[in-house]
């Protein structure tokens, strides 16, 4: 025959445990039933009745199976900087995020508890490491014969355009000028269109090392600002 | 522009500690990222990890997380790798790379080829 | 981690020729992707970094494509020099990782 399904509350076996979702109460010393997420403990089970269960209230929340006596608060309303990816429900606690253009500076068990706009890359600097939810931006500056003239947080620095002759060359922050002969293009025509990531903090404040001022040997990029360090190289 | 030149063979035992040395010159340490890629004999190329020296901040891949440790002297523009519990697969050539604004790995070290032996 | 296969593993081009290498990534990797060449006895060197842009002082034989998951290098009119192994990287997410290397010979 079956063994007997016992109903909470009940006396478990010496070195048993209580089933899921049931929980052994030291008082009553019998194993009683859990609430479920949503719901808190009302009354608490005796040796003759089992836990009484009430919905949590509007701003608290239990996200688990539980035997507490009262829901939790549901956190604060999320700041200016931040989204609200997760509403308060019964169920479950807000979630907010940074906003784009802002990063994570201090994390909490779920969401943000201090976002931080991301750091722009000043002219001569492009994004060596682009920003993600939990980290900022990383600015360095252009290589030789290379170079980036915008202030972004997404931009990397670009080939210099190669000029049959050069009238101006160029730098870290400019793209060198040719004469009037036309140059060739170091791609495709047309910028590279990367998606926009999350974006902007203080600039990058320090000196721009000036490459070589000798006639740029590289290739051109159309003019404009750099393409975007699209993506993000995640934590 | 920008040289990156390592520091010499090394042969190390099993469980031995291995440091790297990778001396930038032409420019700053503190305008590159630095990242360490290993490649095995007749391998492909894996990265280990990568130091911001002008912040101190670290990133490694989680193969090597436990076992690497990137340090960076800015007084002297000299990048190092720590790889430590060595076993004979970690016998490779390590190579440090420099990163600058173009987000790419613009320079590369000349290879430290380290063999792991008994 | 993301996973870069490149193909084919190796690749018997004559010179004057044209090459053409692939790379898939496991995942979308946007265009964060860089093609590097490597000798043998020699360092890596970038010859394309944000899937199409060639950097400064790779000739216009060079060109790279792609976006998303498909990546592809293209060298024009093969020159003897240009005979070699070459990785395909994605820096979209962490690990950083590299494709296995396609080596490309004389045929």
């Known amino acids: 025959l079956p063994a007997q399904v016992a109903f909470t509350p009940y006396a478990p076996e010496p070195g048993s445990t209580c089933r899921l979702r049931e929980y052994y109460d030291q008082t009553a010393q019998m194993c009683c039933s859990k609430c479920s997420p949503g719901q808190h403990a009302k009354v608490f089970c005796t040796k003759t009745s089992d836990t009484v269960c009430d919905s949590c209230e509007d701003s608290t929340y239990t996200q688990l199976w539980n035997w507490v006596p009262e829901c939790l608060s549901c956190g604060s309303r999320c700041s200016s900087d931040q989204v609200e990816t997760q509403a308060c429900t019964r169920e479950q606690n807000r979630i907010c995020t940074c906003r784009p253009g802002w990063y994570c500076a201090l994390s909490k068990q779920e969401g943000c508890r201090l976002c931080a706009p991301l750091r722009k890359c000043r002219p001569g600097f492009g994004v060596a490491r682009p920003g993600t939810e939990t980290s900022d931006v990383v600015c360095k500056p252009c290589a030789p014969g290379t170079f980036s003239n915008t202030t972004s947080s997404t931009d990397i620095c670009r080939p210099h355009q190669i000029c049959n002759v050069v009238a101006i060359p160029g730098n870290a922050s400019m793209d060198a000028v040719c004469t009037s002969t036309s140059p060739t293009r170091s791609m495709a025509p047309g910028a590279v269109h990367l998606p926009q990531p999350v974006s902007t903090r203080s600039q990058h404040t320090q000196p721009t090392p000036e490459p070589s001022t000798a006639p740029s040997t590289s290739f051109l990029l159309p003019m404009g600002p750099s393409p975007p360090a699209e993506g993000s190289t995640g934590d | 522009e920008v040289q990156l030149v390592q520091s010499g063979a090394e042969v190390k035992k099993p469980g031995a500690t291995v440091k790297i040395s990778c001396k930038v010159s032409?420019?700053?340490?503190?305008?590159?990222?630095l990242h360490w890629v290993q490649q095995a004999p007749g391998k492909g190329l894996e990265w280990m990890g990568w130091i911001d020296p002008e912040e101190g901040k670290t990133k490694y891949g989680q193969k090597f997380q436990s076992r690497v440790t990137i340090t960076a002297d800015t007084s002297t523009d000299t990048a190092y790798m720590e790889l430590s519990s060595l076993r004979s697969e970690d016998t490779a050539v390590y190579y440090c790379?420099?990163?600058?604004?173009?987000?790419?790995?613009?320079?590369w070290g000349q290879g430290t080829l380290v063999t792991v032996s008994s | 981690d993301i996973v870069m296969t490149q193909s084919p593993a190796t690749l018997s081009v004559s010179p004057g020729e044209r090459a053409t290498l692939s790379c898939k990534a496991s995942q979308n990797v946007g265009s964060n992707v860089d093609w590097y060449q490597q000798k043998p006895g020699q360092s890596p060197r970038v010859l394309i970094y944000?899937?199409?842009i060639r950097y400064t002082g790779i000739p216009a034989r060079f060109s790279g494509s792609g976006s998303g998951t498909e990546f592809t290098l293209t060298i024009s009119i093969l020159q003897s020099e240009d005979f070699a192994v070459y990785f395909c990287?994605?820096?979209?997410?962490?690990?950083?990782?590299f494709g296995q290397g396609t080596k490309l010979e004389i045929k």
């Open positions: 032409g420019y700053s340490i503190t305008d590159y990222l």
């Open positions: 790379a420099a990163q600058s604004g173009t987000g790419t790995m613009d320079a």
């Open positions: 990287m994605q820096s979209k997410s962490y690990p950083i990782t």
């Open positions: 944000k899937a199409s």
